[in-house]
Amino acid sequence: RKIPKVGHTFFQKPESCPPVPGGSMKLDIGIINENQRVSMSRNIESRSTSPWNYTVTWDPNRYPSEVVQAQCRNLGCINAQGKEDISMNSVPIQQETLVVRRKHQGCSVSFQLEKVLVTVGCTCVTPVIHHVQ
Amino acid sequence: GITIPRNPGCPNSEDKNFPRTVMVNLNIHNRNTNTNPKRSSDYYNRSTSPWNLHRNEDPERYPSVIWEAKCRHLGCINADGNVDYHMNSVPIQQEILVLRREPPHCPNSFRLEKILVSVGCTCVTPIVHHVA
């Protein structure tokens, strides 16, 4: 999947664009909005009818190295009595994000953009029931 | 920066941390090419906290299209299919990384940007604060 070139007619390539070797792109990894803390939607994960836990995955060859993933606590959903109702399903809600992957080939290092799928939380859904003939 | 294990036979000049600017391959490595959540699942309709998906488009960003969730109700759908206002449908917000064209309009020069997106909705029991 390649990053699309700017296709709009009003997007002419400015003279100020940095020269970039063919087949690659220049990426500044000083993050815009980095002053924002990386954090999760804390405090709803336990109050949800489809509660979830968080785990942190760590990879030193990935930027950012820390990615937080949610996991649904139950297969079913929590009812008004606080019990699991297995007639409903807790399902993960997922979102893609970009990371930079560092690859070592011998002594040389290359960088690759990668899309990763992050589970951000869970929601309670009515199950789809397939009737087997 | 991030410290990484290094091949002991390599020259010491290599930085242990990610450099500020890198040249990356134009091909994005991924197995998840479906960016329209309407096609990937129907949870947005089947959830007890259903949501609508709104298209957020920005040609100076990659990906240029991001679908954002907006909860349909303040309450949640109960077993009878009615909205129960004793519960709350709440958007789940997540910070994600995208690419921002920098300088603007340049085809192959980007900067990472952290943005806040609404991914879906979940049904929660409200905390009621009684204001004196």
Epitope: M40 | P91, E95, P126, V128, H130
Partner: nanobody
Amino acid sequence: EVQLVESGGGLVQAGGSLRLSCAADGRTFSTYGMTWFRQVPGKEREFVAHIPRSTYSPYYANSVKGRFTIARDDAKSTVYLQMNSLKPEDTAVYYCAVFTGGTYYVPTAYDYWGQGTQVTVSS
């Protein structure tokens, strides 16, 4: 139905400060992100600041970054907008809104608004 009541607006000299408050009903407040917008007559409502629920950091419009601070007090069901180093171009009606999803800086994503409070900055 959601009730939002803004207060704290007024007339202030350039360089001065004001603190706006937006009180919500407790059931709604603790569960949702809250956002301030502003509007000048004849113009679109403009995003000012967004404070998501709980541990997320706030987001600000570039025009107010470093001058305005959004904060919330869940116990009082109130969101505040501290406005420092005010400029004449900050003159507007300021509205708070409950975030129920969509793109947080787009006014059409919001269904629940306060009545607004007028801020006038004189030079």
